[in-house]
Interface confidence: low
Amino acid sequence: MHDSNNVEKDITPSELPANPGCLHSKEHSIKATLIWRLFFLIMFLTIIVCGMVAALSAIRANCHQEPSVCLQAACPESWIGFQRKCFYFSDDTKNWTSSQRFCDSQDADLAQVESFQELNFLLRYKGPSDHWIGLSREQGQPWKWINGTEWTRQFPILGAGECAYLNDKGASSARHYTERKWICSKSDIHV
C-alpha cells in the first residue's frame, strides 16, 4: 500500500532537492540526504557496471580482429595454459623434426622456455617421460630456439646431441632422429 506520508517512498530522483537542507524537518532532511547519497551511489555503480559490460562486449567483439585487446585468455582443447602461454604435451612419440612439424601444423613451435617458473611447470606437468623442446644446435654452433634466437643459458643442457629435451631432472640433448614425446607452445588465444 502506498503511504503518502512516507517521504522516503514518495521522493523520486527528479524531485530530489538540490540542497537536502531545504527540507523543513530534521528527520526529513536526514532521510532526504540518505536517499540522495544512496541514489547517486546506485547511479554511479550502475554506470560503472554498464560501462564495464559495454567495454567487455566491445573487446570480445574485436577479439578475432585484434587479439591483443582481449582480456580473457584461453587455450585450445587439450592445451594447458600457464603464464599467458599455451602448452601441448604429446602422448605420441616422434623425432625432433617431426615433433616440430606437428607443432607447426598447430600454429605453434616446440616449447620455448622463457623462465624458471615455466621450466618448473613443464618439468612438473610432463611427468617422468622425456619431452622434446624447441632448442637445437648445428655442429660447433650455439644452442638456438626454434625462432632463431640464441639460448641464454637459463638452465644446463647435458649431453652432446643437437636437440634438447626435458627429462625427469632438467634438460638434456640427443640426436634429432631419436623418438620422444614433445611439448608445443604458443601464445594464449584470447576469447
Epitope: K94, N95, W96, T97, S98, S99, Q100, R101, C103, D104, S105, L110, S136, I146, N147, G148, H176, Y177
Partner: antibody
C-alpha cells in the same frame, strides 16, 4: 649425386585429372628430414608451390589448391606421384619436383630440382 | 600467407656492375628462412642462398644474401654474362611456402 625427373602427359583436356611422377636417385625418401615437393610455373610467370611429402608420410598442400591435389610416395621405387583433379587451361605450366632437406622442423629450401615437364591443358 | 614482393621487376645493366635485388615480405619471415633461386631461360631454378645469407654449395662468392625480418636483398658484386637470368626469393618459415614474382636481370 641427386637427380630428379618428372614424367607424365604433356597434354590434358579440361576437367581431366593430371597424374605426374617424380623419379629420383641419390637420396632416399626414408631418410629422416627428406622431403619431395612439387612446384609449377605457368609460361612467363612466377613459381608456385603445390605440395610436399616427407619421409614420414607427412603431407602438405597449397591452401588454394588443396582440394584438387593428392601427393603420395613409393619409397621402394624412389618415386613421388602428384595427382591434380579437374584440370583447367589456367593450370597450363611447367611442373617441377624438387628435393628438400628439412632440418629445422619448419620446412626447408629446395636444393635440387628436376628439369620440369610442360603440361598443356586444352580441349 | 606471407606475400613476397620483389623489386624491380626488370633490371638492365652491364657485365661488371654491382646489383642488389630486393625482396620484401608482408610479414616477418620466421627465423629468416628465406631462399634465393636463379632461373636461366629454359632451365629449372637453382638454389643460390638459403637462411637469408648462407650460400649454397658451388655458388660463386660474388653472390651474397642479406636482410632480416621483412626486408631481404640478393647482391651480385660483379655481374658476369651467365648471371643474366630471373631471380626468385622464397620463404619457407611459415606455411604455405611462397615465392616472389621474380626479378629479371637483362643485359643493357
Amino acid at each position: 649425386q641427386v637427380t630428379l625427373k618428372e614424367s607424365g602427359p604433356t597434354l590434358v583436356k579440361p576437367t581431366q585429372t593430371l597424374t605426374l611422377t617424380c623419379t629420383f636417385s641419390g637420396f632416399s625418401l626414408s631418410t629422416s628430414g627428406v622431403g619431395v615437393g612439387w612446384i609449377r610455373q605457368p609460361p612467363g610467370k612466377a613459381l608456385e608451390w603445390l605440395a610436399l611429402i616427407y619421409w614420414d608420410d607427412d603431407k602438405r598442400y597449397s591452401p588454394s589448391l588443396k582440394s584438387r591435389l593428392t601427393i603420395t610416395k613409393d619409397t621402394s621405387k624412389n618415386q613421388v606421384v602428384l595427382t591434380m583433379t579437374n584440370m583447367d587451361p589456367v593450370d597450363t605450366a611447367t611442373y617441377y619436383c624438387a628435393h628438400r632437406l628439412d632440418s629445422s622442423g619448419r620446412g626447408g629450401y629446395f636444393d635440387y630440382w628436376g628439369q620440369g615437364t610442360l603440361v598443356t591443358v586444352s580441349s | 600467407e606471407t606475400t613476397l614482393t620483389q623489386s624491380p621487376g626488370t633490371l638492365s645493366l652491364s657485365p661488371g656492375e654491382r646489383v642488389s635485388l630486393s625482396c620484401r615480405a608482408s610479414q616477418n619471415v620466421y627465423s629468416n628462412f628465406l631462399a634465393w633461386y636463379q632461373q636461366r631461360p629454359g632451365q629449372a631454378p637453382s638454389l643460390l642462398i638459403y637462411g637469408a645469407s648462407s650460400r649454397a654449395a658451388g655458388v660463386p662468392d660474388r653472390f651474397s644474401g642479406s636482410g632480416s625480418g621483412t626486408d631481404f636483398a640478393l647482391t651480385i658484386s660483379r655481374v658476369e654474362p651467365e648471371d643474366f637470368a630471373v631471380y626468385y626469393c622464397q620463404q619457407y618459415g611459415t606455411s604455405p611456402i611462397t615465392f616472389g614474382q621474380g626479378t629479371r636481370l637483362e643485359i643493357k
